[in-house]
Amino acid sequence: RAPRCRELPAQKWWHTGALYRIGDLQAFQGHGAGNLAAPISGLKGRLDYLSSLKVKGLVLGPIHKNQKDDVAQTDLLQIDPNFGSKEDFDSLLQSAKKKSIRVILDLTPNYRGENSWFSTQVDTVATKVKDALEFWLQAGVDGFQVRDIENLKDASSFLAEWQNITKGFSEDRLLIAGTNSSDLQQILSLLESNKDLLLTSSYLSDSGSTGEHTKSLVTQYLNATGNRWCSWSLSQARLLTSFLPAQLLRLYQLMLFTLPGTPVFSYGDEIGLDAAALPGQPMEAPVMLWDESSFPDIPGAVSANMTVKGQSEDPGSLLSLFRRLSDQRSKERSLLHGDFHAFSAGPGLFSYIRHWDQNERFLVVLNFGDVGLSAGLQASDLPASASLPAKADLLLSTQPGREEGSPLELERLKLEPHEGLLLRFPYAA
């Protein structure tokens, strides 16, 4: 008799794929035709592009009125006219819903100011946030984000209260908190009192970019958080290029999309947008490079392969890899909610298996080092339910030159510098 199927876990929409942060709507909008409309309307115009990335939610803003460091002139219920109108926002919500993209609103109060939470007027601000949650939930948003919560006194209790409001409205609404902290104990204390909170932090940005260290960070985090749902990013707001050299971007994309939890990216991560390559652009919010005319300040500074348009036409680009990974992440059961087992594969490597019941299984092998390595996959570390076969089919490599679909012998696996492999193999009874 065939073994009984394992019961599928209840999955919320944010469990099914990546979130995409657009912190600065004006920078995302770019130049040229994009400037024809207010940024919120312009964003509505980009929804088909965002659909092509298969992201499940957009984290927007903040877009509310905020006069720097002035709590009285900060209105979380009003959209700053520089971004558009409430009508534009309603229209964006409707259009996003039609495309099955959720909208999460960042309500970090003093986003233009020195301290995000007006440290001296915490109670006033907390009341404003409560009112804003209720107002925007009624307006139809799917969730909220608050950042820099290390600057919020009694953050845990406020987050619990805001979570109650959000979940009280609907279990299908999400609260994301962001912190600059990379300290696991601080992160765990924030998570302890908030069951469904999604937390973005700088935890992984501390990895020192070695395989062993990354493996130990990931496994420590997963062990410490038990069976709660995680999110994966390198920071609460910044681009991957703020932390990573170009040669590791593909590796990290592969990792973030295949770890158990929700991957969270910032606009431009899909193309390797790098403020350092754009003189005069702010590090935290460089202009999005839609095409070569997107950065007119210095003619010739932007080449086609740095842009969405150029990378869309190149199957070997970072954008094409992002799209493929996002697609796999959103449709394969083992990646959607499969178990995770990390195991030894040799120095400099991080490898793990994702598997769910009798579905196709995935093996990820990541070489963080700048030398080629032979992987010694130690299957003895794995439980019987996740044993390795002798061969697995190559689904994709982060480097060009490998024949996709070809079976690779796992005992003789060689990886190029900074190469990541995603392999698949069937369940065997």
Epitope: A33, G34, N35, A37, S41, K44, G45, R46, G84, E313
Partner: antibody
Framework: QVQLVQSGAEVKKPGASVKVSCKAS????????ISWVRQAPGQGLEWMGW????????NYAQKLQGRVTMTTDTSTTTAYMELRSLRSDDTAVYYC???????????????????WGQGTLVTVSS | DIQMTQSPSSLSASVGDRVTITCRAS??????LNWYQQKPGKAPKLLIY???SLQSGVPSRFSGSGSGTDFTLTISSLQPEDFATYYC??????????FGQGTRLEIK
Amino acid sequence: QVQLVQSGAEVKKPGASVKVSCKASGYTFTSYGISWVRQAPGQGLEWMGWISAYNGNTNYAQKLQGRVTMTTDTSTTTAYMELRSLRSDDTAVYYCARGELYSGYDGTLGILFDYWGQGTLVTVSS
Amino acid sequence: DIQMTQSPSSLSASVGDRVTITCRASQSISSYLNWYQQKPGKAPKLLIYAASSLQSGVPSRFSGSGSGTDFTLTISSLQPEDFATYYCQQSYSTPPITFGQGTRLEIK
């Protein structure tokens, strides 16, 4: 509901100027762009240029550069198109249209014209 | 500038007929093509955008297809109110926005 209402017909002499208005209502004026499109008698449609009601940025068709000016007045939610040094081949119906943006797979922005004014006939004749 | 060429320039058809109008771009415009209908003395009306998306309120007998350089507008079963002039418009390489020269659809 969204409406664009244009000013009435004009008869002008060659060399003169004409200014056509387009009053918008039923939506947030500053959130969209306005394009101007003209149609000579019995002919097809010709795009003249656009203006962003959000920030006043303009872009004009090459052949009209230097003769056309597009402006907006956000207080009255009205767009204007002024054409100078009129010639007989400028005789046409002039339309304003709201520009809505959309994008595709490669992120390029397309523009569609979802609402149009009723048209203003400008006749240039000596 | 991208040139848009429509064919035929005019055609005659009867109520109930299936009609196809084509539009060719002088270079690839991906799916950045819109179709408009214009009746005499009236402003154009948007029918299809992004090559195949039906504008809200437009009857489902209208459909669009194509990408790259070749596009078609199809009316599955002509109704009396469909006799008009149809224009394609590209907005891939903007500015400038360019229109086709139009196709006049008349009653046979």
